[in-house]
Amino acid sequence: SGTTNTVAAYNLTWKSTNFKTILEWEPKPVNQVYTVQISTKSGDWKSKCFYTTDTECDLTDEIVKDVKQTYLARVFSYPAGNVESTGSAGEPLYENSPEFTPYLETNLGQPTIQSFEQVGTKVNVTVEDERTLVRRNNTFLSLRDVFGKDLIYTLYYWKSSSSGKKTAKTNTNEFLIDVDKGENYCFSVQAVIPSRTVNRKSTDSPVECMGQEKGEFREI
């Protein structure tokens, strides 16, 4: 049969950050091609990435339709040049992915400090509200739009002259912290979803320090 050297995909893995979601798998194809299907638990299968020689498939467009749903994908293997061929049981070989719930599992992308402004002994630090590929009414939603108060930011801040990191938290995208007069501070933020049990934290933002371009200093 034409399927004797067709192998099923394995190591199916979801790679997802801020809802940009790609399914990856192995092996690199030799004389075979793949097609991916995705479905919610109760929905119909939808085919994507038809007869591809890639070992990844961007499923973002499907999962952003409802990020709180749980999705399952499967990867079909076909002999190259003979995609009508089926396996010995009359079905093409396929492998199921783990289940994936974007809202609970997508990795939080690295945040960015948009600006900071010092007024006397207070500093206001603002975190950029990153746009996602989730749409509502033809508009792309921000991370805050999607997660609401489930998303918090932890601010690490420290005097340029010391190493100890103080922390502050907010469920908006702004911090207002007390600082010592005449001291320069550095800042880094981390996105956190405390209600999760895994993938709770993002990587830290790049460090921004007072006396650099992003900040503004006003003596009052």
Partner: antibody, heavy 120, light 107 residues
Amino acid sequence: EVQLVESGGGLVQPGGSLRLSCAASGFTISDYWIHWVRQAPGKGLEWVGYIDPYNGYTYYADSVKGRFTISADTSKNTAYLQMNPLRAEDTAVYYCARDYGSLQVQLDYWGQGTLVTVSS
Amino acid sequence: DIQMTQSPSSLSASVGDRVTITCRASQDVNTAVAWYQQKPGKAPKLLIYSASFLYSGVPSRFSGSRSGTDFTLTISSLQPEDFATYYCQQHYTTPPTFGQGTKVEIK
């Protein structure tokens, strides 16, 4: 089940050193923060310091700054408190606690504590 | 650092009594205040978080409230297992700080 287990306490002379361990199970420490809190005999609770095991960031109480170091080994799911040089006033039960990391909840789970006695 | 001034340092009460413990923060801490119960030889246990929310598994006779920088822990009807030491703690800023503790003893 979330559990924190401290170990490494004991009797040590002033000027000596000790390393306490806090072994976590039921959760991954890099997803949370770990704090150390101590309690001298018959006294109240005193915060010692914290670590974010994800990035290694730490902060210490003034009373221990420069003498104590908090670290974490995420592969062992364990946090550590290295103490030196020790003073008599460091005699206490040392607890590690998990920081849930929300605006509302901080120290939600605590270990059983380990006693450190600094005496000649 | 923010000081948490707890009072009284100790009190004697009987089973069934209503008990109130207060904590005053030296500056604004919003609602970032927790209350812990500690029994001799044991680790502290979280009772109340965010000033007024009952932690999972804690009996409903415990409650917390806030008025500005004043925080109150109330035990509506003291039970034999409630004789312990209680601590308030703020986590609004680093370093977090504890009150001195209130020992609730049997009258």
